[in-house]
Amino acid sequence: QTWYDSLGAINKIQDFLQKQEYKTLEYNLTTTEVVMENVTAFWEEGFGELFEKAKQNNNNRKTSNGDDSLFFSNFSLLGTPVLKDINFKIERGQLLAVAGSTGAGKTSLLMVIMGELEPSEGKIKHSGRISFCSQFSWIMPGTIKENIIFGVSYDEYRYRSVIKACQLEEDISKFAEKDNIVLGEGGITLSGGQRARISLARAVYKDADLYLLDSPFGYLDVLTEKEIFESCVCKLMANKTRILVTSKMEHLKKADKILILHEGSSYFYGTFSELQNLQPDFSSKLMGCDSFDQFSAERRNSILTETLHRFSLEGDAPVSWTETKKQSFKQTGEFGEKRKNSILNPINSIRKFSIVQKTPLQMNGIEEDSDEPLERRLSLVPDSEQGEAILPRISVISTGPTLQARRRQSVLNLMTHSVNQGQNIHRKTTASTRKVSLAPQANLTELDIYSRRLSQETGLEISEEINEEDLKECFFDDMESIPAVTTWNTYLRYITVHKS
């Protein structure tokens, strides 16, 4: 086990050292507007290289008995942009409202502006002085004041204005220590609404030319939200350029410009009155035929949780969701903690898996409705993000036992034919073929919103005989003590490198 851990660590260091140098973006501080011209962007472009290599290495390989022990079909993941040909221009002091269904690319758009996601095509123009408010509120161990000022020079008038605009005056007045009350470790626990308002106040307090607000009102009551939207976003920040990710018609009405994204493309860009004129047309185009129609509202949140938890391509960085993170992109909150992180790696989330078997395979299944999410190791079934999971369809997977065991263990069992009854029992059989299809299934009643974004032109088949004990070793871990995430990428690298 230590040997495998060491190898893994060395490989990760090596991968990191071989990555391209991070290029600091050049900004023009005199720029007053924010412009995006024909921007197209991809997440994790290096991912494509891995599969190209896998494709070459496995082109002519078959297992000894002529049967495909494990293979993937319809792997059309390459060249899928998360943003396609996006254009907009907002002048200083304008409010751009960005809306769209799940996976539309709303957070990706913000990430491109921040330089977290580099566009493969197009131009972005802004001053570079940006403040970002995530949809996941987060608190640093420290006082309320420290959490809002957050290292920026203190300005009494500005601070008081922000506190008032973010509706924090009443909350602060309840504490004897006022804004010097300690939060986090050894301090008081805030409600979700209080955390959200402090996170917003932090972003607003920072002096910037452009404010990126990613669904900041998600966990606020409607009265507070209305007041903050008016007093903070519309009044206090009136002379600042603001981009607000929102789903509320009320916010769209107040915005100078509206950008509606759909499957990474700009579906509408204009004013609210123009949107009103076009809305019946929108509905007729989208009703019943587009995938967002079949998804529940909690999936409105951004596809790119990954950016906020800053995983590497491997996704193996140990992260405990209950910890308070000090890095701004490892954000969790009272609500975020319970949120199932099905989209830790966005590349992994744009595909739906199905399993087809020649012979019945015993497995423990997938636990879906637990109150607290388990740490994700490897899953063949993506969650529907915030706690409601997409279960495999009956027509796709036919298994006897009730689906109720641990997600990661079930996948390990599935791949190693083991049955978990308190201990791992391994048995080997070659009769079973496991087919993992990464393209949308024609017989599914609900098309995955991400699958619809995949091109269906290229296919990739990987046939590989796997040493089960090696695989077991590779995935062996202690659920209690190692909160690591082993992604599909890691597994694929494993089967590519460790050839039998």
Epitope: S101, S247, K248, F282, K285, S296, A297, R300, E334, K338
Partner: nanobody, 123 residues
Framework: QVQLQESGGGLVQAGSSLRLACAAT????????MGWYRQAPGKQRGMVAI???????DYADSVKGRFTISRDNAKNTVYLQMNSLKPEDTATYYC?????????????????WGQGTQVTVSS
């Protein structure tokens, strides 16, 4: 046409319990946050409790530990279990929901309010 209808209000004695329910009906595609708000005579309307689609909750300090909000997504219904009621809980209780109508693309939501149900707690 979307409508919210509250039920369960009434006159009770201090220390007793009540359960409010609010059902959303009409051409509903999805519902995001739902919540309960109250307005006592001569006072502003204020939040009592809210619940997100996946069940995360937030409460006003005055009701924490006594009131519990829950929802049934399948029935488009939100509930408020009120225990250990106090005279100061007397108010008209309003239900709120962020609803995407069937005719709305892209999960664009609007705010909807119920007519309110009266809760009176006598000492």
């Amino acid at each position: 046409q979307v409508q919210l209808q509250e039920s369960g209000g009434g006159l009770v004695q201090a220390g007793s319990s009540l359960r409010l329910a609010c059902a959303a009906t009409g051409s509903i595609r999805s519902i995001n946050n739902m919540g309960w708000y109250r307005q006592a005579p001569g006072k502003q309307r204020g939040m009592v409790a809210i619940i997100t689609r996946v069940g995360n909750t937030d409460y006003a300090d005055s009701v924490k530990g006594r009131f519990t909000i829950s929802r049934d997504n399948a029935k488009n219904t939100v509930y408020l279990q009120m225990n250990s009621l106090k005279p100061e809980d007397t108010a008209t209780y309003y239900c709120h929901a962020e609803i995407t109508e069937q005719s709305r693309p892209f999960y664009l939501t609007d705010d909807y309010w119920g007519q309110g149900t009266q809760v009176t707690v006598s000492s």
